[in-house]
């Protein structure tokens, strides 16, 4: 360092500012889910690469099935390593019924208030993992609509799992989950052969979320 | 604390009826499977068959159709295995467990996570 | 239906020794949906590893699942005093299930 370096007034890391998102992750946890550790082996691999912490990335976790569980909110943990434990005793709650749009009506309701720890001017991200098409899905291009009308980015996760041990065509359900996830619908939906295979868009899925950060 | 609790021996003659019963506690028992598992005297295990309690929807193993029927009532979170008319055949433990898995949508899949601690039942 | 058929039908070992269990499948079990449980006598079947490899929880890492397609494995590394009892194997790719005769582990 040369004699005259000085110190001038520092402008503070763009990293600082731009790691705060308010994730959310909706998991479907009806029954046909399985093995349910895969779901949670995924968490575990995306949330270890997040920077947690109430001045950081928030995360929260909604189930849902035929009703929903806000498993944590966003303001709950307050460092990754918290969010780690917790995301790993997540138990699959059962049912037979995915009710896709009340999961993702619910998080855009309530897990994203003020109250559950959403923060104000904080851009907010929603993380949909689900194996079927939804049961309410009359109601989806509302709820969809309503989480655009308050610029939620939806990333969609499409598990093929049970349509290919039924031997069942997907298409009509990769559709509807392409539907969920924002515009472009290329970078913002995903999908995996079965649950097993979660783990391998995890790399490619947080990087996109990441991105985020820097828009 | 997930635990299934089934109801007690019984000892029967050959033609009477018999209701058995095991009762769920610690999750959602309407939202899982439940499977019936026969084990004769010294044998090995055999399902039998399993049943939804949400909507009572039931599937039974080729071997059992027709000799049982197993129902459940979501109230009392309890699941059910009736015979019309015994056999001495009958004679084995009978357990009921809980699938972590699915049957709907064309298939059936996924393991046996919990376990009643069976009812023996006695038909001579 | 598939018939899962377990060798040998009786493992004679002393603690601290190696068990290893073989399930063979008549046909392919498709996503390597086997499970193993434990049965003592009395006693109602404990789960140990389904997904062929998985452990459930709560059970010990002397226990471990392996194999896929027809052929499965059930590896004990070193054989405790409470380990000595009948394991099952079970298939669930077939939509239905079916157990294996089962292979009984007693002491030397």
């Known amino acids: 360092v040369s004699p005259t370096f000085q110190v001038v007034n520092s402008i503070a890391p763009v990293q600082e500012c731009s790691t705060q998102l308010d994730i959310v992750i909706v998991l479907d946890g009806s029954n046909s889910i399985y093995p349910w550790d895969s779901v949670t082996a995924f968490l575990n691999d995306l949330l270890e690469r997040m920077d947690i912490g109430p001045k950081q990335t928030q995360v929260g976790i909604v189930q849902y099935g035929e009703n929903v569980t806000h498993e944590f909110n966003l303001n709950k943990y307050s460092s990754t390593e918290e969010v780690l434990v917790a995301a790993k005793k997540i138990v699959q709650r059962g049912g037979r019924q995915t009710m896709t749009a009340l999961g993702i009506d619910t998080a855009r309701k309530e897990a994203f208030t003020e109250a559950r720890g959403a923060r104000r001017g904080v851009k907010k991200v929603m993380v949909i993992v689900t194996d079927g098409e939804s049961h309410d899905n009359h109601r989806l291009k509302k709820v969809i609509q309503d989480c655009e009308d308050e610029n939620i980015q939806r990333f969609s996760i499409a598990i093929l799992g049970s349509y290919n041990r039924g031997n069942l065509s997907t298409e009509k359900f990769v559709e509807e989950i392409k539907s969920i996830a924002s515009e472009p619908t290329e970078k913002h939906f995903f999908n995996v052969s079965d649950e097993l295979a979660l783990v391998t868009i995890v790399k490619t899925l947080g990087e996109r979320i990441f991105a985020l950060e820097a828009t | 604390e997930v635990q299934l609790v089934q109801s007690g021996a019984e000892v029967k003659k050959p033609g009477e009826s018999l209701r058995i019963s095991c009762k769920g506690s610690g999750y959602s028992v309407s939202s899982y499977w439940i499977g019936w598992v026969r084990q004769m005297p010294g044998k090995g295990l055999e399902w039998m068959g399993i049943?939804?309690?949400?909507?009572?929807?039931?599937r039974y193993s080729p071997s059992f159709q027709g000799q049982v029927t197993i129902s459940a009532d979501k109230s009392i979170s309890t699941a059910f295995l009736q015979w019309i008319s015994l056999k001495a055949s009958d004679t084995a433990m009978y357990y009921c467990a809980r699938l972590q898995g699915d049957c709907s949508g064309g298939s059936c899949y996924g393991h046996f996570d919990y376990w009643g601690q069976g009812t023996l039942v006695t038909v001579s | 239906e598939i018939v899962l058929t377990q060798s040998p039908g009786t493992l004679s070992l002393s603690p601290g020794e190696r068990a290893t269990l073989s399930c063979r499948a008549s046909?392919?079990?498709?996503?390597?949906?086997l499970a193993w449980y434990q049965q003592k006598p009395a006693q109602a079947p404990r789960l140990l590893i389904y997904v062929a490899s998985r452990r459930a929880t709560g059970i010990p890492d002397r226990f471990s699942g392996s194999g896929s397609g027809t052929d499965f494995t059930l590896t004990i590394s070193r054989l405790e005093p409470e380990d000595f009892a009948v394991y099952y194997c079970?298939?669930?790719?077939?939509?239905?299930?079916?157990f294996g005769q089962g292979t009984t582990v007693e002491i030397k």
């Open positions: 049943i939804y309690p949400g909507d009572s929807d039931t």
């Open positions: 046909q392919t079990i498709s996503s390597g949906y």
């Open positions: 079970q298939q669930y790719g077939s939509s239905s299930w079916t």
